[in-house]
């Protein structure tokens, strides 16, 4: 099985124990590590952070001791903006320039492939996204002719039903991608006005009608029905939780909220907590399991957080094995307890390790 793990370059800027550099990563933990994110400047793939080149080197030296490890560079992301991607993909010349710039950049910096993180193509971009993928793959095949190992091509796709319908020609893009990471998280957010788990495995009794498509099982099944081969589908598992501030004494699933949860000490983003911050939060919190959805949530005071733990990730891995998927994807290594100092197990990357162990289990 593949274990595809994202590393985010901006995690270096977190304070103190939250700061994560690629040299802190475990070279034997994942089969693929994806560095997020690269930029596109003047239609050419480019660095984003001032020290990206240094960090690329740090990451790719992990392969010295583990030659089986593959590294990919992810281009795009939330801050890149869908509109910018749209302009490049929809213009034949811009698209060609971008595609041509990719292989030399990846080779220069020691990457084994490219991950496309266009978040997200609109319905008007659907055809252009397919063309971008098809042409990128053709370029990779051509570039590998002189006996080089062919560069890998993957894409991170939304698990939201409306986005899947609007953005992706699943059957066509699947033909050209080496694997597809389906982002089976962020199904539920503060915009709903109630508590809810952002990455349930199944729908569960707790979900009202609007949420019938907002679960991992549905998204995976729908992708397969739309023509994605199971052998290319990698299922996303988050090492972060989504938090809410409760608006009343109700604390269950569907309780009213006043907004996102308070920011974490290190990640500093309202409504999001890294797993290592959740481990801190759990001290003195009340933990519940949403049985139908097979995921936990915890409450403390007026704070509510839905997250994944070692038990839930094992359920998810068993599910993806039952579905005969290609493996699991983790967002993100730097949100797991990468130092092993927060979750009281003397184990670095406890969630990702639990996923790895479950994948290896017979």
């Amino acid at each position: 099985y593949k274990l595809v793990c994202y590393y985010t370059s901006w995690s270096q800027y977190r304070e103190g124990d939250g700061s994560c550099f690629p040299d802190a990563l475990d070279r034997f933990l994942c089969t693929h590590i994806i560095y997020s994110f690269a930029n596109i400047s003047n239609d050419h793939i480019d660095t984003w952070e001032w020290n990206d080149v240094t960090l690329y080197g740090m990451l790719n030296t992990l392969k010295n001791r583990n030659p089986n490890l593959k590294t990919l560079l992810s281009v795009g992301g939330w801050n890149f903006g869908s509109q910018r991607f749209s302009k490049i993909a929809s213009n034949t010349q811009s698209r060609r320039t971008f595609i041509k710039s990719v292989p030399p950049f990846l080779r220069t910096h020691g990457f084994d492939g490219l991950d496309l993180a266009w978040l997200y193509p609109g319905r008007r971009d659907k055809q252009h996204f397919t063309t971008l993928i098809k042409e990128m793959k053709a370029e990779f095949i051509k570039e590998a002719q002189p006996g080089k190992k062919q560069l890998l091509l993957s894409a991170a796709l939304s698990a939201g039903k409306v986005t899947i319908d609007s953005s992706y020609d699943i059957a066509k893009i699947s033909q050209h991608l080496d694997f597809i990471s389906i982002m089976t998280y962020d199904f539920h957010g503060a915009w709903r006005g109630t508590t809810g788990h952002h990455s349930p495995l199944f729908r569960g009794q707790e979900d009202a009608s609007p949420d019938r498509f907002s679960n991992t099982d549905y998204a995976v099944g729908y992708m397969l029905r739309l023509g994605a081969p199971a052998s290319k589908l990698v299922m996303g598992i988050p090492t972060f939780g989504r938090s809410f501030t409760l608006a009343s004494s109700e604390t269950g699933v569907g309780a009213p909220i006043s907004g996102p949860g308070i920011p974490g000490r290190f990640t500093k983003e309202a409504g999001t907590l890294a797993y290592y911050e959740i481990c801190d939060f759990l001290r003195g919190a009340t933990v519940h399991r949403i049985l139908g959805q097979q995921v936990p949530y915890a409450t403390k005071g007026n704070q509510w957080v839905g997250y994944d733990d070692q038990e839930s990730v094992k359920s998810k891995v068993q599910y993806l094995k039952d579905r005969q998927l290609a493996g699991a994807m983790v967002w993100a290594l730097d949100l797991d307890d990468f130092q092993g100092s927060f979750c009281g197990q003397d184990l670095r990357f406890p969630l990702t390790n639990a996923i790895k162990d479950a994948l290896a289990a017979t």
């Epitope: 609109g122 319905r123 008007r124 055809q127 039903k161 409306v162 986005t163 319908d165 609007s166 009202a208 009608s209 609007p210 019938r212 729908y222 029905r225 739309l226």
Partner: antibody, heavy 120, light 108 residues
Framework: QVQLVESGGGVVQPGRSLRLSCAAS????????MHWVRQAPGKGLEWVAV????????DYADSVKGRFTISRDNSKNTLFLQMNSLRAEDTAVYYC?????????????WGQGTTVTVSS | SYELTQPPSVSVSPGQTASITCSGD??????ASWYQQKPGQSPVLVIY???KRPSGVPERFSGSTSGNTATLTISGTQAMDEAAYYC??????????FGGGTQLTVLG
């Protein structure tokens, strides 16, 4: 407010052609997908054709494929349906309808309709 | 033949709850929308994405979906609700498809 006004309907003989228009106002026409939906006398609604916001993408119901052509002129805020080789079963009220092209698959605004009668 | 099946007619007394169903395999994977059409008028969207109500549509209109069946519920039905109701969905293979329509009659 959003307004869609169809025109161009009438009585036409089988095998002949007709061109329907839909004048749009009250919204940014060039940002929306547009559809034609028809309703035969005493019958239900039948989707006919769709065109993307910029006219680059079109799709048709099997019953009209090869005979009808949907088009638009964004500079004039107008949608068209060119109907060729008309048949008796094309007799219906034809509505133009709007669709928020980025994320929706339903019709949030409809015109009042224009009647097409195909009869010898 | 319709991909979406609706009962041809439903009758209800004023003030009572009317339920109109719409069934079809595509509803397992697709959102249902509902339209109201009064005689001589064009259709009006009353429910989209299974349960969402456009602004201006009275709260007595609600939608739900379970499995392959979508339901439009009108609670406290009024005489003005007498109309034909159509369900609609989109599918990658069938594009936009409507149910055959249900005539709601408000008795009395």
């Amino acid at each position: 407010q959003v307004q869609l006004v169809e025109s161009g309907g009438g009585v036409v003989q089988p095998g002949r052609s007709l061109r329907l228009s839909c004048a749009a106002s009250g919204f940014t026409f060039s940002s929306y997908g547009m559809h034609w939906v028809r309703q035969a006398p005493g019958k239900g609604l039948e989707w006919v054709a769709v065109i993307s916001y910029d006219g680059s993408d079109k799709d048709y119901a099997d019953s009209v494929k090869g005979r009808f052509t949907i088009s638009r002129d964004n500079s004039k805020n107008t949608l068209f349906l060119q109907m060729n080789s008309l048949r008796a079963e094309d007799t219906a009220v034809y509505y133009c309808a709007r669709d928020d092209y980025d994320s929706t698959y339903y019709f949030d605004n409809w015109g009042q309709g224009t009647t097409v009668t195909v009869s010898s | 033949s319709y991909e979406l099946t609706q009962p041809p007619s439903v009758s209800v007394s004023p003030g009572q709850t009317a339920s109109i169903t719409c069934s079809g395999d595509i509803l397992a994977d697709q959102y249902a929308s509902w339209y109201q059409q009064k005689p001589g008028q064009s259709p009006v969207l009353v429910i989209y994405h299974d349960t969402k109500r456009p602004s201006g549509v009275p709260e007595r209109f609600s939608g739900s979906t379970s499995g392959n069946t979508a339901t439009l519920t009108i609670s406290g039905t009024q005489a003005m609700d007498e109309a034909a109701y159509y369900c609609q969905a989109w599918d990658i293979n069938t594009a936009w498809v409507f149910g055959g329509g249900t005539q709601l009659t408000v008795l009395g």
